[in-house]
């Protein structure tokens, strides 16, 4: 739980309060809302970020067609329960005792129920499809330049290992970024694709979570890449369980 020692701030999470009262008098940064100490050398988990957000004063195809099991986060913001490691608890409930099961990115994957609802395990989201539409430009971006720039972004800004960026698809004006990360592939210390996708989503919306950094300035060969729409699909290792009523 280290932070920048010089002025005791958290470079990777502005939604923290930092104080030199950690072990050995070292700087310790706590996430707003939960008070949990965060590791400022990497991304903070989406669960703790959502909790902090709630406490603080979205023809021939080379594009991927999301599977029928893909989830979109339609429920919006909620104040989540996080486990001691900062991950989402499998079962989430609101103040009126309405409960539902979520996946590892906190997206609802069952119908809503009452307090008797059981969520046996936290189901991992192993495939995330980020669907972007960019603003009109003079011409299309070069696909390989775009691919290289987005991979660099995920590697350098979000510290996501390159092997987890499975593909970048482009069909003007739509860009799709595929992130894949199975449970077996994720080693200790690896950034979670769900956390990287959330930081990216907030960056794209102009709501950067990084401390003191300017907003995201995406450029491909000097040409600004301005996103006007974002849609994120989440695919779980186990398909979601919704009643037919919801599907119709």
């Amino acid at each position: 739980h280290t932070a920048a020692q010089d002025n005791c701030t958290c470079p990777t999470n502005k939604m923290t309060v930092c104080s030199p009262d950690g072990p050995g008098g070292r700087c310790q940064c706590r996430a707003l809302g939960s008070g949990m100490a965060v590791d400022c050398s990497t991304l903070t988990s989406k669960c703790l970020l959502l909790k902090a957000r709630m406490s603080a004063p979205k023809n021939a195809r080379t594009l991927v067609r999301p599977s029928e099991h893909a989830l979109v986060d339609n429920d919006g913001l909620y104040d989540p329960d996080c486990d001691p490691e900062g991950r989402f608890k499998a079962r989430q409930c609101n103040q009126t005792s309405v409960c539902w099961c979520v996946n590892s990115v906190g997206v609802r994957r069952t119908d809503k129920g009452d307090l008797s609802l059981r969520c046996d395990e936290l189901v991992r989201t192993h495939h995330i499809l980020i669907d972007l539409r960019h603003r009109p430009t003079a011409g299309a971006f070069n696909h390989s330049d775009l691919d290289a720039e987005l991979r660099r972004l995920f590697r350098e800004r979000y510290r996501l290992h390159p092997k987890f960026v499975a593909a970048v698809h482009y069909e003007q004006p739509t860009i799709q970024i595929e992130l894949r990360q199975n449970t077996s592939q994720k080693a200790a210390g690896d950034v979670d694709i769900g956390d990287a996708a959330y930081y990216f989503e907030r960056d794209i919306k102009g709501e950067s979570l990084f401390q003191g950094r300017g907003g995201l300035d995406l450029r491909v060969r000097g040409e600004p890449l301005q996103v006007e729409r974002t849609l994120i699909y989440y695919l779980d290792e186990i398909p979601p369980k919704f009643s037919m009523k919801r599907l119709t």
Epitope: V17, S19, P20, D21, G22, S34, G35, P84
Partner: antibody
Framework: QVQLVQSGAEVKKPGASVKVSCKAS????????INWVRQAPGQGLEWMGN????????NYNQKFKDRVTMTRDTSTSTVYMELSSLRSEDTAVYYC????????WGQGTLVTVSS | EIVLTQSPATLSLSPGERATLSCRAS??????IHWYQQKPGQAPRLLIY???ESISGIPARFSGSGSGTDFTLTISSLEPEDFAVYYC?????????FGQGTKLEIK
């Protein structure tokens, strides 16, 4: 040396409010959390909440959320804890304490609620 | 919230003996546990922080250990002034919580 000095004892009637102060010295006031802890007669310690003096971010124990307010005055390095709608069960010694590991404590302020 | 359970509630020992006080957390909290001593009419005093880190000015006979959910405060050889109430406290997440205390009394 680090010191936290609290205001004197108070006697209040049920339904009233009390405001206890905690003046800090000997360290950078804005860099450390100040917590409030209370102890009813013969009982254990109970955390009420804390405030980060740098930006006034405060955080309250759900039990006191509707009745407690913590504020600070950086010009005098003083933190205040106000508890409203007092009842007899609020009779206790109220302490301020610094940081996450409560390394320095005030001397305590006895608040007696009695009709 | 995280519940801390201290045991035993009362410990009766003689000066010179070794005291072992336990604190168990309802969920894993790493090493975010702190130990305090309180004597009648006084404010608590920090003895050990972050499970095992010593505090300057606190006698070396006080030591702490543990991580996760189980923590121990050990007083290697009791002195007459050590008889008091001892509390553990967690700072893993808000709300911070205290154990109910262990009273260390003279046998």
């Amino acid at each position: 040396q680090v010191q936290l000095v609290q205001s004197g004892a108070e006697v209040k009637k049920p339904g009233a409010s009390v405001k206890v102060s905690c003046k800090a010295s000997g360290y950078t006031f804005t860099s450390y959390w100040i917590n409030w802890v209370r102890q009813a007669p013969g009982q254990g310690l109970e955390w009420m909440g804390n405030i980060y003096p740098s930006d006034s971010y405060s955080n309250y124990n759900q039990k006191f959320k509707d009745r407690v307010t913590m504020t600070r005055d950086t010009s005098t390095s003083t933190v205040y804890m106000e508890l409203s709608s007092l009842r007899s069960e609020d009779t206790a010694v109220y302490y301020c304490a610094r940081g996450s590991s409560f390394d320095y404590w005030g001397q305590g302020t006895l608040v007696t609620v009695s009709s | 919230e995280i519940v801390l359970t201290q045991s035993p509630a009362t410990l009766s020992l003689s000066p010179g003996e070794r005291a072992t006080l336990s604190c168990r957390a309802s969920q894993t909290i790493g090493t975010s546990i702190h130990w305090y001593q309180q004597k009648p009419g006084q404010a608590p005093r920090l003895l050990i922080y972050y499970a095992s880190e010593s505090i300057s000015g606190i006698p070396a006979r006080f030591s702490g250990s543990g991580s996760g959910t189980d923590f121990t405060l050990t007083i290697s050889s009791l002195e007459p002034e050590d008889f008091a109430v001892y509390y553990c406290q967690q700072s893993n997440s808000w709300p911070f919580t205290f154990g109910q205390g262990t009273k260390l009394e003279i046998k």
